[in-house]
Interface confidence: low
């Protein structure tokens, strides 16, 4: 599923991401934009053999199990396929673990490079939340 900007903002808010670990909703929507272009089925292979999955491009080396990443830790205890669902529950639950891990949203390269320090509130402007 490819979410609309405000549709995703509403879904993320419903799942409790607004101000989760101090990161406003705009940060999460911005991250999703530059990680996956709001596409829940986005997958990208990394040079180390791991793969990033879903709307927040969660990595199979650490966070999920795709059955093909050597040494996978699967810290979210989920199959990576679950992160491709049109329902973002699995991605959100896992993202909450990731952002609580010490580095905050710096874990997402796209957020670090494209969202951090910018007017992230623009990503939810005009949305009825």
């Amino acid at each position: 599923k490819v979410f609309g900007r405000c549709e995703l903002a509403a879904a993320m808010k419903r799942h409790g991401l607004d101000n989760y670990r101090g990161y406003s909703l705009g940060n999460w929507v911005c991250a999703a934009k530059f990680e996956s272009n709001f596409n829940t089925q986005a997958t990208n292979r990394n040079t180390d053999g791991s793969t990033d999955y879903g709307i927040l491009q969660i990595n199979s080396r650490w966070w999920c199990n795709d059955g093909r990443t050597p040494g996978s830790r699967n810290l979210c205890n989920i199959p990576c396929s679950a992160l491709l669902s049109s329902d973002i529950t699995a991605s959100v639950n896992c993202a909450k673990k990731i952002v609580s891990d010490g580095n905050g949203m710096n874990a997402w390269v796209a957020w670090r490079n494209r969202c951090k320090g910018t007017d992230v509130q623009a990503w939810i402007r005009g949305c009825r939340l």
């Epitope: 089925q41 989920i78 396929s81 491709l84 049109s86």
Partner: antibody, heavy 116, light 107 residues
Amino acid sequence: QVQLQESGAEVMKPGASVKISCKATGYTFSTYWIEWVKQRPGHGLEWIGEILPGSGSTYYNEKFKGKATFTADTSSNTAYMQLSSLTSEDSAVYYCARGDGFYGYWGQGTTLTVSS
Amino acid sequence: DIELTQSPATLSVTPGDSVSLSCRASQSISNNLHWYQQKSHESPRLLIKYVSQSSSGIPSRFSGSGSGTDFTLSINSVETEDFGMYFCQQSNSWPRTFGGGTKLEIK
């Protein structure tokens, strides 16, 4: 509107295999999980597993690994569940449902009877 | 696996009564809890998603509440068409699991 149409009732012999179908209409089939659920009298509802038709990704309840196999044909918007090595324990109503975490749309159910 | 325990197993009520059905999870499932109604020889029907969000077309007498491990489905002034089985289901983790059900029957 969203609809899931399952194949008709089946009577099979122990040891045989059966393939149940679930045809989806009214939405983009490839991007939503199709869930499979088993119901036996006195046993409530049991989640068998799910398939994401667009990618072919599957996830099975450990209890049903080796028993159920999911496939999907995006050209006909149809999901399939094959059950193998049938026993009387497999006699049940099997439902497909559209997965959104919750299951907002269900098929009408396929009744499977396994009897010699 | 997360176990969902529903109580009571059977609830005998008179039309017009208000009732509460309980669903308890073996561990915290946040707000990832959904309720279904199933009548005899029919498929389950979604009533409530994410604890308290009413599904499309569901009468306002049905409502849900709770969080974490304890959840309640309330029916305000039961009508005759409400009798049947009620199941809760969690989507917090895999495998998805259902409660054993509560049978709502006419007294």
